[in-house]
């Protein structure tokens, strides 16, 4: 036999005007019942019984996973990054086959000098992390490498990284134009062939809080939205208070349904409340109570 579930009812009036009872478990919806020992659970919306309580899937909560949360945790990365694939031609070092072997002493020495040179070139860029040589080839030394950029996540992170990549382009163009050989001699740390500088590809971290919010909200995706507070994104429904998009239910309770947020209006000893935002109060007829 099914165990009986205590159902508490609250007298609420929907914004359409009819008084309804809202049990903590919606017994009008067919549910699957699982019995574990003496316990009986009705875990809805994909929730499962762990032996003590329903473990609910996002965005649900409640004893039977029947209610929709007002906010969903979304976690942007602490930092976001960009990787620029660049090629420069170094003329102050002559290519030897040993440079192709990344564990050779030649490669290590070249890598050290090249890294020092690029650290000087990009020293004024706060997002600059470092360089990573991916390949060295003949010509004198054609250096295929990645420039790594990183910044703290903010809503404007793409603009920050886009700006940084532009500065990288400007700086590498400048140094490879200025540091050139004179009479087969280089007086700089490294010299370059001006025409050998190319930006092959730029990859920027893709993080979209709106997309994460929509994915986690599942069938409620149209009703959850992202608002920022202190540069941090929050995935909220209109039932979450304290945000620009918050729904004010006045004398009522905000509840999410698959048609969006609605206000369930309360009935007090003295008033009925109605209206879309439960802001229309109707006074009940006076009854004199003798105490």
């Amino acid at each position: 036999p099914l165990a009986t579930i205590p159902v508490s009812t609250t007298s609420l009036t929907s914004s359409e005007g009819s008084t309804i009872s809202t049990p903590s478990v919606d017994i009008s919806t067919p549910v699957t019942t699982s019995i574990v020992g003496d316990q009986c659970s009705r875990c809805k919306n994909g929730g499962f019984w762990d032996g003590l309580k329903c473990q609910c899937l996002t965005p649900y909560y409640g004893e039977s996973c029947e209610e929709v949360v007002n906010s969903i945790d979304i976690a942007p990365p602490e930092t976001v990054s960009a990787q620029m694939e660049l090629t420069v031609t170094v003329t102050s070092v002559k290519f030897t086959d040993e440079l192709k072997n990344h564990s050779s002493q030649e490669f290590r020495e070249f890598n050290k000098t090249f890294t020092e040179q690029m650290n000087i070139v990009y020293s004024g860029i706060p997002e600059y992390v470092g360089v990573n040589i991916t390949n060295l080839r003949l010509g004198s030394v054609v250096v295929e490498h990645d420039v790594l950029l990183r910044t703290k996540y903010t809503p404007e992170y793409k603009t920050a990284l886009d700006n940084a990549t532009e500065v990288v382009k400007q700086k590498i163009t400048k140094v490879t134009t200025e540091q050139i050989m004179t009479n087969d001699n280089c007086s700089a740390l490294m010299c370059f062939n001006t025409t050998g500088t190319q930006v092959q590809n730029i990859t920027v971290t893709q993080y979209d809080p709106v997309e994460e919010c929509r994915q986690k909200a599942e069938e409620y995706e149209d009703y959850f939205l992202v608002e920022y507070r202190d540069q941090k994104p929050y995935c909220i429904s209109p039932c979450e208070s304290g945000f620009n998009a918050s729904k004010n239910c006045n004398h009522g309770k905000c509840q999410m349904s698959q048609n969006g947020a609605r206000c369930l209006c309360v009935t007090t000893e003295t008033h009925w409340y109605s209206g879309e935002d439960c802001n229309q109060g109707t006074q009940k007829s006076h009854h004199h109570h003798h105490h």
Epitope: T91, S92, V93, K94, T96, E98, Q105, E106, E109, F110, K112, T113, E116, M181, D184, N185, C186, S187, A188, L189, M190, C191
Partner: nanobody, 123 residues
Framework: EVQLVESGGGVVQPGGSLRLSCAAS????????WGWFRQAPGKEREAVAL???????FYADSVKGRFTISQDNSKNTLYLQMNSLRAEDTAMYYC?????????????????WGQGTQVTVSS
């Protein structure tokens, strides 16, 4: 790792000669680049004479025709023959090396250094 030890420095009169030697340990002497740099008190280190395994050589304008760089691969030794020495040649002379075939006069591009030998030209 390449280790470099200089010798041959000393005090000499203007117009005199000295021969500096730089003994290298390791098996890299036949490849890469070798050179002599000098640093006078209060001045930056500067390239004096450089040589690479592909035949490239460099001499500072102030020493051209007076100094000669050479190497003996069998002895793993680099030399600097200095003739017609002048007072302005007074400095600490350093031997430098790199396994890379370099074309740069910038000391920061050279990875291995000796401790230096003092050359003083004075009457």
């Amino acid at each position: 790792e390449v280790q470099l030890v200089e010798s041959g420095g000393g005090v000499v009169q203007p117009g005199g000669s000295l021969r500096l030697s730089c003994a290298a340990s390791g098996d890299t002497f036949s490849r890469g680049s070798w050179g002599w740099f000098r640093q006078a008190p209060g001045k930056e280190r500067e390239a004096v004479a450089l040589i690479s395994s592909d035949g490239w050589t460099f001499y500072a304008d102030s020493v051209k025709g007076r100094f000669t760089i050479s190497q003996d691969n069998s002895k793993n030794t680099l030399y600097l023959q200095m003739n017609s020495l002048r007072a302005e040649d007074t400095a600490m002379y350093y031997c430098a090396a790199s396994v890379l075939v370099l074309r740069t006069l910038n000391p920061k591009a050279w990875h291995h250094w000796g401790q230096g030998t003092q050359v003083t030209v004075s009457s």
